[in-house]
């Protein structure tokens, strides 16, 4: 078996629109508690010239500010460069662009490297048909079942979305 | 625990190729993630690729990118580094490793390999 995931079949471009954060997984449980750095969420997505455009949603004093971050193309179909909180190798690890992404990534900042899983949806009433590939991703790369974060409606920021 | 055994090194012209493979005896292959990493003379060990336990997902250094490709097969408990293109900058004592989690950093992975020697000539 070869390492290699491709990018979604219609192109990332299917990517484009609202999500909705579901579940986050790290090794370094600091990283996804509230108000860690990747206690993130996703707000919508957009594709363009082949990198990934994301509106993200992050808490920040009782209040969630809505900042665009870019995740850069690379040589390599399913990875992404990300500059958040160091640099970050953004890995597309599951997609199907009309229910549900799983991505994770390497982050290194100055000289820790971790692990930070995230899995969205387009429709959070169908959030735990899709925990169980969350969970499968997360074992493949190490993360295990008790490193997993599923998140209620008030983490998400709900008030912030338009 | 899980005893490693490197083959397939040598010596290759610049722009060559080699495979490297790497067996495991142990009953955890299964459930560890998989490693290459290289020491070049008078250089520290450095990563040069990783794979999860089932295969499906790779991590490479940019510095082989595009030209080495990680892969395994766990029926066969055998992880394998296909080298393309080498470059002289490639010589190394290349080991094989395995650990818990996908990441590029050494302290990741609890066992190692002896190491098998590739040498690329200019």
């Known amino acids: 078996q070869e390492g290699n995931h491709e990018e979604p079949q219609g192109g990332l471009e299917e990517l484009s629109g609202r999500w909705h954060s579901v579940a986050l997984a790290s090794n370094k449980s600091d990283l996804i508690k509230p108000w860690g750095h990747f206690r993130v969420f996703i707000h919508s997505m957009s594709a363009k010239d082949g990198n990934l455009h994301g509106d993200i949603l992050i808490p920040q004093d009782g209040q969630c500010e809505k900042v665009s971050l870019t995740a850069f193309k690379t040589a390599t179909s399913n990875k992404f460069d990300l500059e958040y909180w160091g640099h970050n190798d953004l890995y597309l690890a599951e997609v199907d662009p009309k229910s549900y992404l799983i991505l994770y990534m390497i982050n290194q900042y100055n000289d820790d490297t971790s692990l930070v899983a995230h899995l969205m949806v387009r429709d959070l009433s169908r959030q735990q048909d899709f925990l169980p590939a969350f969970e499968s991703v997360c074992e493949d790369i190490g993360l295990h079942k008790d490193q997993i974060v599923v998140l209620s409606d008030d983490d998400r920021c709900q008030g912030s979305r338009d | 625990a899980v005893q490693l055994v490197e083959s397939g090194g040598g010596l290759v012209q610049a722009g060559g190729s080699l495979r490297l493979s790497c067996a495991a005896s142990g009953r955890t292959f299964n459930n560890s993630v998989m490693g290459w990493f290289r020491q070049a003379p008078g250089k520290e060990r450095e990563f040069v690729a990783a794979?999860?336990?089932?295969?499906?997902?790779?991590h490479y250094a940019e510095s082989v990118e595009g030209r080495f490709t990680i892969s395994r097969d766990n029926a066969k408990n055998t992880v394998y580094l296909q080298m393309n293109s080498l470059k002289p900058e490639d010589t190394a004592v290349y080991y094989c490793a395995a650990g818990a989690i996908l990441l590029p950093t050494e302290r990741r992975y609890d066992y190692w390999g002896q190491g098998t020697q590739v040498t690329v000539s200019s």
């Open positions: 794979i999860s336990r089932s295969g499906a997902f790779a």
